[in-house]
Interface confidence: medium
């Protein structure tokens, strides 16, 4: 058993049929010595008396809010949550496996630049009685500060018969150094509580590996005289790190016909313009990637050829 | 050329070669997303690797103030990786394919380090850890880790030289 926060405790249980469970001793937080009784949740059934209560925790029916009273007055509470371990593996019932970029990916994180700011998100099908708390640091043995906000519900989607809920959180490294080569990864820890079930999820990454620039901005076409060619121009996204002479991007320009089956013409360039042939009903798209480190490409920015 | 006395390097040449290094490092080990190497215990390699840190002066302001700080650190790293790529970690079994980019990568690391420090000048270099994995599978894992780390190092070096070429070239 360990303390998650004030008056909230997590009991770690090996979860299999007829498991013996864990013996837990609760102590009433009071100077009083006698006349103390214990109850669980809203039940008025007295579970025991005295300053301490010893219980055998085996299943969710044994978890909940234990309260000690004296003469009708509440003295203190202890909320017991369960963390299940099945076949040596902690349960992951609350969050959905996103399976990208690999199996058992519950948390996904992205950064728009090297400023030390990043966003993580996760999915669940659970809609109520759900709380999350997020902690983060750079490194684990000598952790350096990362400040995370509160996790918020950021999207709801219908998947078949199920509703899926996306939660996200924004974090900022306290003393970010965008020009440094990271040697210690960022660690993100999410505590998830659904009713009386506790689970924790972790992710470890370097900012450089989760970089995904915003799409290029101000994408414009300029037809060239007496030619089917056009000059495409664009600018670095506002959210990208500066100066651009240091944090450089590379770009992919694509000409795509109306039909997905049509051959795509692609040009790669480090410049912020390119000359391409504009076919009728086609569209021109541009995306960006860090020039020197192969992290994710941005989403496409597009304009029609016409 | 960046000699220890403090003259400027050939920024544009360094920029071109460092960008080539980035391309080679990624072609030598492209499948980064499919293997989380940090799960395999990094202590022996990455702890000894000369990372470019916040206080090494490789940020734009640091380069403007005194590029020698940063150039010396980059030089140290280039020598370190050049020695690792020439060690039995890469020359031993399992043998690299004849057309493997590792050979080119090795030569380019040496080329850039010589651009930064001509013969006869000496900056201190970092001790190379004695890593001699016994099993071929250990060697393979170590190669991946070294290349992964090299990708991060040359990315910072390439940014430095690109910025230098754009803003500090005579």
């Amino acid at each position: 058993i360990w303390e998650l926060k004030k008056d909230v405790y997590v009991v770690e249980l090996d979860w299999y049929p007829d498991a013996p469970g864990e013996m837990v001793v609760l102590t009433c937080d009071t100077p009083e010595e006698d006349g103390i009784t214990w109850t669980l949740d809203q039940s008025s059934e007295v579970l025991g008396s005295g300053k301490t209560l010893t219980i055998q925790v085996k299943e969710f029916g044994d978890a909940g809010q234990y309260t000690c009273h004296k003469g009708g007055e509440v003295l203190s509470h202890s909320l017991l949550l369960l963390h299940k371990k099945e076949d040596g593996i902690w349960s992951t019932d609350i969050l959905k496996d996103q399976k990208e970029p690999k199996n058992k990916t519950f948390l996904r994180c992205e950064a728009k630049n090297y400023s030390g700011r990043f966003t993580c998100w996760w999915l669940t099908t659970i809609s109520t009685d759900l709380t999350f708390s997020v902690k983060s640091s750079r490194g684990s043995s000598d952790p350096q500060g990362v400040t995370c906000g509160a996790a918020t519900l950021s999207a709801e989607r219908v998947r078949g018969d199920n509703k899926e809920y996306e939660y996200s959180v924004e974090c900022q490294e306290d003393s970010a150094c965008p020009a440094a080569e990271e040697s210690l990864p960022i660690e993100v820890m999410v505590d998830a509580v659904h009713k009386l079930k506790y689970e924790n999820y972790t992710s470890s990454f370097f900012i450089r590996d989760i970089i995904k620039p915003d799409p290029p901005k101000n994408l414009q076409l300029k037809p060239l005289k007496n030619s089917r060619q056009v000059e495409v121009s664009w600018e670095y996204p506002d959210t990208w790190s500066t100066p651009h002479s240091y944090f450089s991007l590379t770009f992919c320009v694509q000409v795509q016909g109306k039909s997905k089956r049509e051959k795509k013409d692609r040009v790669f360039t480090d410049k912020t313009s390119a000359t391409v042939i504009c076919r009728k009903n086609a569209s021109i798209s541009v995306r960006a990637q860090d020039r020197y480190y192969s992290s994710s490409w941005s989403e496409w920015a597009s304009v029609p050829c016409s | 050329r960046a000699v220890p006395g403090g003259s400027s390097p050939a920024w544009t040449q360094c920029q071109q070669l460092s960008q080539k290094l980035c391309t080679l490092a990624w072609s030598a080990h492209p499948l980064v997303g499919h293997m989380d190497l940090r799960e395999e215990g990094d202590e022996e390699t990455t702890n000894d690797v000369p990372h470019i840190q916040c206080g090494d002066g490789c940020d734009p302001q640091g380069l403007r103030d005194n590029s020698q700080f940063c150039l010396q650190r980059i030089h140290q790293g280039l020598i370190f990786y050049e020695k690792l790529l020439g060690s039995d970690i890469f020359t031993g079994e399992p043998s690299l394919l004849p057309d493997s980019p590792v050979g080119q990568l090795h030569a380019s690391l040496l080329g850039l380090s010589q651009l930064l420090q001509p013969e006869g000048h000496h900056w201190e270099t970092q001790q190379i850890p004695s890593l001699s994995p016994s099993q071929p599978w250990q060697r393979l894992l170590l190669r991946f880790k070294i290349l992964r780390s090299l990708q991060a190092f040359v990315a910072v070096a390439a940014r430095v030289f690109a910025h230098g070429a754009a803003t500090l070239s005579p």
Partner: antibody, heavy 126, light 106 residues
Framework: EVQLLESGGGLVQPGGSLRLSCAAS????????MMWVRQAPGKGLEWVSY????????VYADSVKGRFTISRDNSKNTLYLQMNSLRAEDTAMYYC???????????????????WGQGTMVTVSS | QSALTQPPSVSVSPGQTASITCSGR??????ASWYQQKPGQSPVLVIY???KRPSGIPERFSGSKSGNTATLTIRETQPMDEADYYC?????????FGGGTKLTVL
């Protein structure tokens, strides 16, 4: 708690040597540039030398060049200043300071000395 | 090594605003920092990057820069603000400090 603690000062004759130490605690020492600053009695601050986080690069004020050597041992979280050929004008309180790099969205990251030690007094006199 | 010039002393009545200037050739191209040093104590960073305040420094302290002159302003000056104040800038790879200004709260 983030702290710098200097030691090694004292009375020394002209031409003599001293080695100052600065023990760092409460932060990841190996990530920061460090520097020595001195202050003669009743006078202003004068920078002496600074060193990169890895220890590979150093810069000195003209007044101490060739006589003083700055170094660091990241495994011991300690900064050093070896002072040789000491002169009367080197008499001062010697402070070590951490050089913090502040990230600025313009991309130009200013430095400042955000943590200072309590200082150690060096007196050069016959 | 370019010098930074500060007035040797500035006097102010409690509750009033004190301003200390620092001027130097090409200071406009550089960032200025300001340090406070009380008698018998180590310097403390009060302003960096011309106008940024580190955490723990009261809001009464502010910095600004116009051309080649940086200014440290202390609003509602208190007796505890009595100290020497130094401006500082980086000049290429060397560091420059101003001569210091003694602030007296009358």
């Amino acid at each position: 708690e983030v702290q710098l603690l200097e030691s090694g000062g004292g009375l020394v004759q002209p031409g003599g040597s001293l080695r100052l130490s600065c023990a760092a605690s409460g932060f990841t020492f190996s990530r920061y540039m460090m520097m020595w600053v001195r202050q003669a009695p009743g006078k202003g601050l004068e920078w002496v030398s600074y060193i990169s986080s890895s220890g590979g690069s150093t810069v000195y004020a003209d007044s101490v060049k060739g006589r003083f050597t700055i170094s660091r041992d990241n495994s011991k979280n300690t900064l050093y200043l070896q002072m040789n050929s000491l002169r009367a004008e080197d008499t001062a309180m010697y402070y070590c300071a951490r050089i913090r790099l502040y990230y600025d969205s313009s991309g130009y990251w200013p430095r400042a000395f955000d943590i200072w030690g309590q200082g150690t007094m060096v007196t050069v006199s016959s | 090594q370019s010098a930074l010039t500060q007035p040797p002393s500035v006097s102010v009545s409690p509750g009033q605003t004190a301003s200390i200037t620092c001027s130097g050739r090409k200071l406009g191209d550089k960032y200025a920092s300001w340090y406070q040093q009380k008698p018998g104590q180590s310097p403390v960073l009060v302003i960096y990057q011309d106008d940024k305040r580190p955490s723990g420094i009261p809001e009464r302290f502010s910095g600004s820069k116009s051309g080649n002159t940086a200014t440290l302003t202390i609003r509602e000056t208190q007796p505890m603000d009595e100290a020497d104040y130094y401006c500082q800038a980086w000049a290429s790879s060397s560091v420059t400090f101003g001569g210091g200004t003694k602030l007296t709260v009358l």
